[in-house]
Structures are given as C-alpha cells and as structure tokens.
C-alpha cells in the first residue's frame, strides 16, 4: 500500500532497530555532506503515475567477510511513497540505506523523473558509521514547492558497478487551478458565431469551468475542463473570461475583448508629396481599421477648376504603403483628391478632400501649319504658324523656339531663335544663298520646350532669282516634307 504523508503529518520513523528513530533526534552524524554541483536542475513532471511505486534495484555483494559469511543484499529502505501538499509549502523526504563498511566512496544521487538533480537543491547526505555497516540517510528538501516540483523522486547509489535504486517518492503539489489555455482576444463579424476555449488543470482534479461575459456568468452549471464556449453572435464589443474551480479554490483567467468588425474610419492627413505637370504623388494616414485588416484603397480625383466638368477618376491601389502617384492628369489644373480604404466589411467614408494642382509642363504638341517663304526684296525668310491647341500647351505659352538649318555644298549650320508668344510669325535673315533652309518650330512654356514641328525646307537661290511661293508643313499623309519652290 502507498503511504501518504499529508503536509500536517509527523515524520515517519525511518530506522527501526539500532538506527535513530527520526531525523529530529539529537544524534549528531559524524559527517554531513551537501550535494555539491554548479548546475541548476531541470525539474520535470513525472510520467510515472502516483500510487504505483516500483521496487528499487537490489545489489547482492560478492565480497565475503573473513568468516566468509555472505553479505545481505543492499537495498534502500522503504519510505513514504506519496506526499501531497499545497503550493508554496515546504517538504522534506529521505532515502536510507545501510552499507557494509568494506565499501568505500559511496555517494547517493537524487533523480527526478529520470533526470539527475544537480546543483542548487537542498540535498544533504548524512553518514552514521557502526562496527560493520554505515547507515546513510539522504534527505531532500524544498522550502516552497511549486507545480514544477511535481514528480517522481528516487535515490541512486553506485556500488561495484551496480546501481541501487530506491522506490519512488511521488510529490504531488496541489493548488489553485492553473490555466493551460485561456480565451484569446478576437475580432468577429457581427451576429456570427465563434468559439472560446478555456482549459485549466490541478491537482487537485477535477477542475470545473464557469464562463463570464461582461461580469455576468454565462453558464449556470459548470463544465469540466477543458471547456469550449460557443457564442451565437454579438452585436457589440464584449469582455469574456473564465473561472476555473477545484477543491483548493478558484482562478480567474485574463479578460479578453471580443471586438465587432466594422467598416474602417476614413483616412486622415492626405497630403501632397510632389506635383509634376501630369502627376501628383499623395500620401495619407490610414484611419482605424475597424478590427479587420485593410485590403485596398481607392483614390478619388475630381476636376476642381471652376470651369471644369468635374470629371471623376478613381484609382485603386494596395493599402500599403499609404502612398500613390496619380497619373494622366492635365497640366496646370486643380484637382480635389480624397482617399477611401476598405476591409472585409466594406469601404470607409472618403477622407477630407484636399486641393492639389499640377504644374506647368512643356507643350505636348508642336505648332501647326508651319509655312516658310522667301522675301527676296528684304533678303529674309518669313515663317508663319498656328499655336498649338490650348489644352496641349500644358502651360502658359511664353514663346517659340525656331530652329533653322542652312545646308550648302557640304556645309551645315544650325541657328536657334527665340520669339515671344504674341503673334504667330517670325522673320529670319538669309544666312547662305544657293542653299537649303530647314525650319522647325517648338512652343515654349515655363515648363519647358515642346516637340519641334516637322521640318519644312525651302531653297534659297543665288541672287537675282524672282518670285518665290511659300513652302509649308505638308498635309497629313504626304510622305515627303521637302518642298523646293
């Protein structure tokens, strides 16, 4: 039968016969050796079931005395098999063995759940020598037991390369229930069922679970641990916890908040990072995500110029990195920009709208209908054109750049003229006679120089020729832009 020593019980007599009746006597041992080692033991729970101590190993000595009497088999004496006590209490237990004096250097080691206990434990070995035998008492004490001290403890002694093992002493630390699984915070869809799990262990068992929602018990009857609570659905945030009860009392889990997923709050602080003629780089600070991760965002761009149509463009982008370059915009235009983001529930409202402007750009088209003719009387070349459509000027026209290239007998030189924006004609002096003059014109804004028109060529004859018709930009479809009149 298992002997149980409850914490309030007196120590059992360990040594009937010639040995002292208990450790509390005044008999002083000749030698007291604490276990010496620098290691802190790893304490593990015992897989061995309490209540089933195994018989310790027995070593039969081969050595005989002078009279050749065989020595009795060596074995640890039986001791208490099962100690039950509360957390934070102290405990002390012993192993004892009588060893013939012919054996030298015997040491006893303590083991817990198959692992040797090294180091900073209160393990003391006491030796009581007699004529023929030495009584060895190994005691092990724990000043404040914890659950991790639960397990099966044994003593081992090595003699003649034989190992002598004591019966196990099962330490069972009882206390308030201990949670191995507590409910977790969750974000749930409104009116959708979800589960919460709570698990607690003793000893002592059984452990019973009560669920608490917003400070009120959910279940009238307790459930054995582990317990799964199925909540049919919530319409507003709630706090859940579980109570674990055993014979020692109750432990309450952490309270966990169950949030209801909602549409996100609108983004804030939409700001302009950079503007060009045809693009605007914006950033924003996301609003509260409504307890559900953002999926993507929508940038809404509305023409804001007083006479604009107010056309709306919508650009979808990923939720990260809270940055987007809006493209395909008109130059020198005003836009209202708003940002909205979505999670699994839906779209947020639009952020406060901000006003942004594109800058001037270089014109996107060249001047139209370029015409060139020779005014021989003044020895000038007259150039005429039509300004590009306003929409494609991409800014306020500040003037035109005229390129005229003169080619004669292998010599070529290019000259550039800048003319103001007023009017659409220019006059350049003839640079070389008996040469070809090639003219191209580009519109200029503060944003830069636009593309040059297709080249228009005119032949400048030697002095004395008369009457010259104009050369002009060819009509669309005309493959040859060279007109020599």
């Amino acid at each position: 039968a298992i002997t149980e020593a409850r914490e309030e019980a007196k120590p059992y007599p360990l040594f009937p016969g010639p040995f002292p009746g208990s450790l509390q006597t005044d008999h002083t041992p000749l030698l007291s050796l604490p276990h010496a080692s620098g290691y802190q033991p790893a304490l593990m729970f015992s897989p061995t079931q309490p209540g089933r101590p195994h018989t310790g190993n027995v070593a039969i000595p081969q050595v005989t005395s002078v009279e050749s009497k065989p020595l009795p088999p060596l074995a640890f004496k039986h001791t208490v098999g099962h100690i039950i006590l509360s957390e934070h209490k102290g405990v002390k237990f012993n192993c004892s063995i009588s060893v013939p004096n012919i054996y030298q250097d015997t040491t006893i080691s303590w083991w817990k759940d198959g692992k040797e206990l090294l180091g900073a434990h209160h393990a003391i070995t006491q030796f009581y020598p007699d004529d023929e035998v030495t009584a060895i008492i190994a005691s092990f004490s724990i000043t404040s037991v914890q659950r991790s001290d639960n397990g099966s403890y044994i003593c081992k002694m090595k003699i003649n390369n034989e190992e002598i093992v004591s019966d196990p002493i099962y330490i069972e630390v009882q206390g308030l229930p201990h949670f191995t699984k507590q409910p977790e915070s969750m974000n749930v869809t409104r009116n959708t069922a979800f589960n919460l799990t709570c698990q607690a262990v003793g000893p002592p068992e059984p452990v019973n679970i009560f669920w608490v929602q917003n400070s009120s018990r959910v279940n009238e009857q307790p459930e054995k641990s582990p317990s799964v609570l199925t909540v049919p659905g919530l319409t507003e945030m709630a706090v859940f916890s579980c109570e674990a009860h055993n014979d020692k009392g109750l432990t309450v889990s952490k309270g966990v908040q169950i949030n209801i997923k909602a549409i996100p709050s609108p983004p804030t602080e939409v700001s302009i990072r950079n503007s060009t003629a045809h693009s605007i780089l914006i950033s924003w600070v996301p609003g509260f995500d409504g307890y559900s991760p953002f999926r993507n965002c929508s940038i809404q761009v509305k023409e804001a110029d007083p006479l604009s149509n107010g056309s709306v463009m919508i650009f979808n982008t990923s939720a990260l990195p809270h940055l987007y370059q809006i493209k395909q915009l008109q130059a020198l235009a005003n836009y209202s920009i708003g940002v909205s983001c979505m999670n699994e529930i839906g779209w947020s409202a639009v952020s406060p709208w901000i006003l942004a402007s594109t800058t001037e750009g270089a014109p996107s088209v060249a001047p139209l209908n370029v015409t060139v003719f020779l005014n021989e009387s003044s020895d000038n070349v007259d150039i005429r054109w039509m300004k590009p459509p306003t929409k494609q000027q991409d800014g306020e026209l500040v003037g035109y750049r005229i390129s005229h290239v003169w080619q004669s007998a292998g010599i070529s030189k290019e000259l550039l003229e800048e003319v103001g924006q007023n009017g659409s004609r220019a006059r350049i002096s003839v640079q070389v006679h008996n040469a070809t003059c090639t003219v191209r014109i580009a519109a200029v804004t503060r944003g830069g120089v636009g593309p040059f028109s297709d080249p228009v060529k005119i032949f400048i004859p030697a002095h004395g020729w008369v009457d010259y018709a104009p050369s002009s930009t060819p009509a669309p479809g005309n493959a040859d832009p060279v007109l020599i009149i």
């Epitope: 809404q300 110029d305 007083p306 006479l307 149509n309 107010g310 709306v312 708003g338 709208w353």
Partner: antibody
Framework: QVQLQQPGAELVKPGASVKVSCKAS????????IHWVKQRPGQGLEWIGR????????NYNQKFKGKATLTVDKSSSTAYMHLTSLTSEDSAVYYC???????WGQGTLVTVSA | ETTVTQSPASLSMAMGEKATIRCITS??????MNWYQQKPGKPPKLLIS???TLRPGVPSRFSSSGYGTDFVLTVENMLSEDVADYYC?????????FGSGTKLEIK
C-alpha cells in the same frame, strides 16, 4: 443624349420656401458638377453655386449662402436647390447647368407673390 | 471675387458687319473665359469655351481671343440669327462671375 429636366414654374408665398428640381439623364450623374444660375426678368446671369453628385460637395457664391441649399439624390439622378425665406427679390428663372455649362435645363420660373 | 466688366451694353450692327464684344476681368484668369449666346425665353448656349475653343456646331464666324484679363468675342459677317444677348463667364476662380451682357441687334 444629355438632358436636364426642370419644372416650368413654381408659385410661392413670401416667407415660404421652394425646392427646385433638376433631373439628369443621358450621362453618368455622379461624374460631373451641376451648377445653378439665377436670372431675374430682363437681367443678367448670376452664379449661385455648384454641387458634385459624387460626394455631394457643394461650393456656394457667398451672396447665396443661407438662401440656397444644394443637394442631390443619386438614386433618382436629381439635383435640388432649396430656396428659403423667399421675397420678391427671389422671383427669377433658375437654371441648372451641367459641367462647364455646355448643357442647360430649360429653367424654372419661381414667382414670389402673396 | 473676380469682377467682369462687359462692354458695350448694346450693339447695333448692319448685316454682314463685324461685331466685337469685350470683357475685362479684375484678376488674371489665364485663358479661362467662356462666351454664351442667349435668345429670349431660352437658356444660354455655350459658343466658345476656355482657351478660345469654338464649340462643335457653332458657326466659324464666331471667334474669341484674349489671355489674362482682356478678352474679345468677334462675330464676323453678322446674320439676323445672331440677334441675341451675349454673356462672358470667367472661370479663373470661384465664385464664377458673368459679364453684365451685351444686346446685339440688327440695324
């Protein structure tokens, strides 16, 4: 084709209010500004304000703030102008116009008379 | 607020003549000026939009010019169907403001 339909006339008493409607068709209602313009008999044109159906954002001429309130009903593609505390000064033709004033309603004559 | 001064208030032209209507703005509005024609009992009709752009379907005898603060609407070869009120509308800044109008008549 683009159309802006307005009721022909509204007769209201001084101090009362009136809600002038402008039903749009032939285009995407939420994509363009709708403007409101006042024209008193034999007089010139005055801009009251504009509203964007996409987000119901209005811009008002300061002169008409407190007098006119612009709203839209996206489900019926209709813009409204609510005029309050009417006096004889408010007797006029009120036009709604689309986008850059390329399309106009036929106008609603509001007559304020006891 | 940008004010628009339109002149003349009325203009009487013989058939085939050229009519010129001027609008001057109190602030620089770039090229953002619209021109409208209104006939009695009808809503205004957009003739020319910002950037001196002639609207589709509008006869080419109508043209406009100007940039900044000074704008002109020209009607070449006056026809009887051109008898109407003409308004300019500045779109440089809110609030939008119309010119006071010009009544164009046949002599």
């Amino acid at each position: 084709q683009v159309q802006l339909q307005q009721p022909g006339a509204e007769l209201v008493k001084p101090g009362a209010s009136v809600k002038v409607s402008c039903k749009a068709s032939g285009y995407t209602f939420t994509n363009y500004w709708i403007h409101w313009v006042k024209q008193r008999p034999g007089q010139g044109l005055e801009w009251i304000g504009r509203i964007h159906p996409f987000d119901s954002e209005p811009n008002y001429n300061q002169k008409f703030k407190g007098k006119a309130t612009l709203t839209v009903d996206k489900s019926s593609s209709t813009a409204y102008m609510h005029l309050t505390s009417l006096t004889s000064e408010d007797s006029a033709v009120y036009y709604c116009a689309l986008a850059s004033f390329a399309y106009w309603g036929q106008g609603t004559l509001v007559t304020v008379s006891a | 607020e940008t004010t628009v001064t339109q002149s003349p208030a009325s203009l009487s032209m013989a058939m085939g003549e050229k009519a010129t209507i001027r609008c001057i703005t109190s602030t620089d509005i770039d090229d953002k000026m619209n021109w409208y024609q209104q006939k009695p009992g009808k809503p205004p009709k957009l003739l020319i939009s910002a950037g001196n752009t002639l609207r589709p379907g509008v006869p080419s005898r109508f043209s406009s010019s100007g940039y900044g603060t000074d704008f002109v609407l020209t009607v070449e070869n006056m026809l009887s169907e051109d008898v109407a009120d003409y308004y300019c509308l500045q779109g440089g800044a809110l609030p939008l403001t119309f010119g006071s109008g010009t009544k164009l008549e046949i002599k």
